[in-house]
Interface confidence: medium
Amino acid sequence: EVEKTACPSGKKAREIDESLIFYKKWELEACVDAALLATQMDRVNAIPFTYEQLDVLKHKLDELYPQGYPESVIQHLGYLFLKMSPEDIRKWNVTSLETLKALLEVNKGHEMSPQVATLIDRFVKGRGQLDKDTLDTLTAFYPGYLCSLSPEELSSVPPSSIWAVRPQDLDTCDPRQLDVLYPKARLAFQNMNGSEYFVKIQSFLGGAPTEDLKALSQQNVSMDLATFMKLRTDAVLPLTVAEVQKLLGPHVEGLKAEERHRPVRDWILRQRQDDLDTLGLGLQGGIPNGYLVLDLSMQEALS
């Protein structure tokens, strides 16, 4: 708490300018009118205040707006945003994408802080859904943003927003998140032709079911091994050797290098060895010839 002291003669601030960097903390408290500060918040960014001085300016705004800052002030907070706590931000009502962008710019290049996470949460909840423009903005600043959301939160992403998603935005997504995103992507890209569709859907295939992978295998897509390794194990297991060969095209040779890793390892265990031998890759571990293959999942369903 800064002690209340009278402003020295001639030091009352008429405008927010860089003369204020030379003010001691108590002089800022005494000589800067909070209403003047609020109307000239855009000035603060142009002035190299110390962190201690920014604390005083924040304190003045907190006194002026105990229920939370208006958006006109929030939009121009600049580096003062870094002084805000998640509790401060929860009082805000941020509706403008420009305001969001301005504050994300301040934190650019840093990890997503609790303040930023709270700001985004407030903004998205206020909008009701993650629309394309918002998603575009958030993934531009934080490529991993999408994968930080829970499957429940992702369910509010409209299919139209999927167009804003880049492959790198999905790098850290787990299968549960891709399970939610894949059907949206399938819907979003459904009117594209084969090769264009595959380019767009590729990043989302970690959420694809078996029947969609079977369909893709009929389209000469030449899936690379990196994509194949991210597919759901339970979706890959039912694929036949012929289907995997068609799905991977020339990349099928890469199976040898991945034979000890999931989902390739588990898939090999489900294939007949003589079918695997047709690939000519020396893949071992398939079901020996003459053995009967029981579909246990079918048996469980019948019992």
């Epitope: 008429r14 405008e15 300018d17 860089e18 003369s19 960097i21 030379f22 001691k24 855009d42 000035r43 960014n45 142009a46």
Partner: antibody, heavy 116, light 109 residues
């Protein structure tokens, strides 16, 4: 990058006038106070004039008060110094600089020579 | 506007530490924390080295430091290097104007 470029200097006779310009780029010009500082050949720095970011306040050294006028056009990102009734002692390199109370970015300077 | 008083020259050997003083009055240097220091190499524009008595702009070596006592401000350069050879000016706010010192030539021996 942040840059200030002065122009308008030259040779002028005593009693004459000259208008210096300073083109700013690489920063939000309208957010910053600006100043003019001069340096006579072989001498030290002398503050000449300053103007607030909004043009609401202007400041002058006693030596130029009433003769020089500082102004700015934020739409053109340009600072000006109108110099009238020039004297021999006004001969100097004139620098424009960012800010009013300390100067973190300087132009390369423009030479003003007052001589008959 | 009365100029602030600086020594005309100072010198030091590489690696040494030198201090340049800047003396004003109770209405400029002594009145507030608006003391700034500038470095100027021959034929070049000045460069801000210290502002608000002791704050360093980003990009300025931490070998440069500032301080103030009463009506006198000081710039200290430690671990002197050849490229530090230049003219150094102090400045301070005086009511509604800025006033510079006369400048100090630093020679690295």
């Amino acid at each position: 990058q942040v840059q200030l470029v002065e122009s308008g200097g030259g040779l002028v006779q005593p009693g004459g006038s000259l208008r210096l310009s300073c083109a700013a780029s690489g920063f939000t010009f309208s957010s910053y106070g600006m100043s003019w500082v001069r340096q006579a050949p072989g001498k030290g720095l002398e503050w000449v004039s300053g103007i607030s970011y909004s043009s609401s306040a202007t400041y002058y050294a006693d030596s130029v008060k009433g003769r020089f006028t500082i102004s700015r056009d934020n739409s053109k990102n340009t600072l000006y110094l109108q110099m009238n009734s020039l004297r021999a002692e006004d001969t100097a390199v004139y620098y424009c600089a960012r800010y009013l109370y300390y100067f973190d970015v300087w132009g390369q300077g423009t030479l003003v020579t007052v001589s008959s | 506007d009365i100029a602030l008083t600086q020594p005309a020259s100072v010198s030091g050997a590489p690696g040494q530490r030198v201090t340049i003083s800047c003396t004003g009055t109770s209405s400029d240097v002594g009145a507030s924390d608006t003391v700034t220091w500038y470095q100027q190499h021959p034929g070049k524009a000045p460069k801000l080295m210290i502002y608000a008595v002791n704050k360093r702009p980003s990009g300025v070596s931490n070998r440069f430091s500032g301080s103030k006592s009463g009506n006198t401000a000081s710039l200290t350069i430690s671990g002197l290097q050849a490229e530090d050879e230049a003219d150094y000016y102090c400045a301070s706010r005086d009511s509604s104007s800025m006033v510079f010192g006369g400048g100090t030539k630093l020679t690295v021996l």
